[in-house]
Interface confidence: low
C-alpha cells in the first residue's frame, strides 16, 4: 500500500504533503486546512495540465471567506514545474489569507506573469524565501513577482538563483525590507552583488547575508554596498574564500558607520583582512586559518571578537583579545 501523501501532526500545527504519484490526488491536501505550517512537495511534476481543471482567471473574492478562515501562516511549495498563470492564480487567492511566510523551492516557473489587475489586492507577506527557482522571464522576475506582493515584506531570501541579478529599473523599492539573504549563490561575485543590490531599492536593510556567494575581499563588498547605498547593521560574509590583501590600485572604501556586526568565519583567512571597518561591536573570525594571534593594530576596535577554531588557538591558551568570545575549545570547523 502506498503511504498517505499528507501528514498532519498531532497539534494540527504542521502538515507536510509529498505528491510523488504521476496523477496525484490533490484533494488529500485538504487535511492541511487546520495547519499553521504547510509544506507541499510535488515530486517534480509539471502542473501545466492543472490549468485545464482550474479557472485561473476566476474572481478570487468568491473564495475570500474560506481562505480567511485558514490558519496557515507559513507555506512551502516545492519540486514542480509551474505555469506563471497558475502561480498568479494561487497568489491572488492567498492574498485573502493570513499567510506571513512563503517559501518556493526547486520550482521552474514557465511563461510570463500577467500584471496585477487594478481591483486585485497584493499578498501581505513578511517573509519570502526562494531556493533554486528558475523563471522564464530572466532578469525581470523579481519585478513581476513584486507587483503581486504588498510593500510590507521584511525578509527576502534568494538562494541558488538562476538569475541573481535583477532588472533594477523595473523593480520598485522594498521600503520595509530589513533582512536580505543572497547566500548560496556561488556565482554571484562582487560584480553580481552590485547588479543585485539595485541602488535605493533596499533603503531599510539591517541584515545582509552573503554566505557562499563568491565574494573575494571585504573591501570589494564595501564598494558594492556603497554603490547601492545599502547600509546594513549586520553583514555575513562567512563561507567565502576571502583574500586578506587588497588590490593596491583599488580605491579605499569607507564602511558605513551603521555596520556593527561582521561575520568572516569559514573564510579561509590566513591573516586578518585589510580594510575592515574601524569600529565593530561583533567580529567573528572563527574557523579560519590564522596561524598567530592577531595584533591589536590589525583589528578593528571591537567589543566581541570570536577566534575559535583557528590553528594558533589550542585549548588553554590565554585569550588573545580583551572581550573576545573564545571558548578555549577548538570547534569542529
Amino acid at each position: 500500500t502506498t503511504p498517505e501523501p499528507c501528514e498532519l501532526d498531532d497539534e494540527d500545527f504542521r502538515c507536510v504533503c509529498n505528491f510523488s504519484e504521476p496523477q496525484p490526488d490533490w484533494s488529500e491536501a485538504f487535511q492541511c486546512v487546520s495547519a499553521v505550517e504547510v509544506e507541499i512537495h510535488a515530486g517534480g511534476l509539471n502542473l501545466e495540465p492543472f490549468l485545464k481543471r482550474v479557472d485561473a482567471d476566476a474572481d478570487p473574492r468568491q473564495y475570500a471567506d474560506t481562505v480567511k478562515a485558514l490558519r496557515v501562516r507559513r507555506l512551502t511549495v516545492g519540486a514542480a514545474q509551474v505555469p506563471a498563470q497558475l502561480l498568479v492564480g494561487a497568489l491572488r487567492v492567498l492574498a485573502y489569507s493570513r499567510l506571513k511566510e512563503l517559501t518556493l523551492e526547486d520550482l521552474k516557473i514557465t511563461g510570463t506573469m500577467p500584471p496585477l489587475p487594478l481591483e486585485a489586492t497584493g499578498l501581505a507577506l513578511s517573509s519570502l524565501r526562494l531556493r533554486n527557482v528558475s523563471w522564464a522571464t530572466g532578469r525581470s522576475w523579481l519585478a513581476e513577482l513584486q507587483q503581486w506582493l504588498k510593500p510590507g515584506l521584511k525578509v527576502l531570501s534568494i538562494a541558488q538563483a538562476h538569475s541573481p541579478a535583477f532588472s533594477c529599473e523595473q523593480v520598485r523599492a522594498f521600503p520595509a525590507l530589513t533582512s536580505l539573504d543572497l547566500s548560496d549563490n556561488p556565482g554571484l561575485g562582487e560584480r553580481g552583488l552590485m547588479a543585485a543590490l539595485c541602488p535605493h531599492k533596499f533603503p531599510a536593510i539591517q541584515n545582509l547575508a552573503l554566505r557562499n556567494t563568491g565574494m573575494e575581499t571585504p573591501t570589494g563588498v564595501c564598494a558594492a554596498l556603497a554603490a547601492a547605498g545599502v547600509q546594513p547593521h549586520s553583514l555575513d560574509l562567512s563561507h567565502n574564500s576571502l583574500r586578506a590583501t587588497v588590490n593596491p590600485s583599488a580605491p579605499r572604501c569607507m564602511w558605513s558607520s551603521a555596520l556593527n556586526s561582521l561575520n568572516l568565519s569559514f573564510a579561509g583567512l590566513e591573516q586578518v583582512p585589510k580594510g575592515l571597518p574601524a569600529k565593530l561591536r561583533v567580529l567573528d573570525l572563527s574557523c579560519n586559518r590564522l596561524n598567530r594571534a592577531p595584533q591589536p593594530d590589525e583589528l578593528p576596535e571591537v567589543d566581541n571578537l570570536t577566534l575559535d577554531g583557528n590553528p594558533f588557538l589550542v585549548p588553554g591558551t590565554a585569550l588573545p583579545h580583551e572581550g573576545s568570545m573564545n571558548s578555549g575549545v577548538v570547534p569542529a570547523c
Partner: nanobody
C-alpha cells in the same frame, strides 16, 4: 514568555458600548498582526477584527459598529464596540502573530489571551 492581557469586558445593555484592551508583554519579538476573536456558547471561535499588514479586516456582522486600533508605544490593541447587540455576547480573545526580530528563519508564533467575557442584555 509572551503574554496577552485582556481587559474591558463586562455586562452592558443592548445599544451600549464597551472598549476592550489587550496588552502584549513582548521584547524579543516584533508584532506583525493583532486581532480580536470571539466565541459564543456552543459555537466556534470567529474573527471579529484584525490589524494585518497595515490594513484592517472586520467580520461583516460588526462592520460599522466595531473599530480596532493599536498603540505601538504601549504594545496594546483596542476594540471599540458600539451599538452592541445581544448576539455580540461571547468570550472575546485577543490574538497576536509575532515573528522573531532576529535573523532568518523568521520564526512565527501565534499567541492567545485568556479571554474576557462580554454580555449584552436586551
Amino acid at each position: 514568555q509572551v503574554q496577552l492581557q485582556e481587559s474591558g469586558g463586562g455586562l452592558v445593555q443592548s445599544g451600549g458600548s464597551l472598549r476592550l484592551s489587550c496588552a502584549v508583554s513582548v521584547s524579543i519579538f516584533s508584532i506583525v498582526d493583532m486581532g480580536w476573536y470571539r466565541q459564543a456558547p456552543g459555537k466556534g471561535r470567529e474573527l471579529v477584527a484584525e490589524l494585518s499588514g497595515g490594513s484592517t479586516n472586520y467580520a461583516d456582522s460588526v462592520l460599522g459598529r466595531f473599530t480596532i486600533s493599536r498603540d505601538n508605544a504601549k504594545n496594546t490593541v483596542y476594540l471599540q464596540m458600539n451599538s452592541l447587540k445581544p448576539e455580540d455576547t461571547a468570550v472575546y480573545y485577543c490574538n497576536a502573530d509575532l515573528t522573531g526580530s532576529s535573523w532568518y528563519p523568521y520564526r512565527f508564533l501565534e499567541v492567545w489571551g485568556q479571554g474576557t467575557q462580554v454580555t449584552v442584555s436586551s
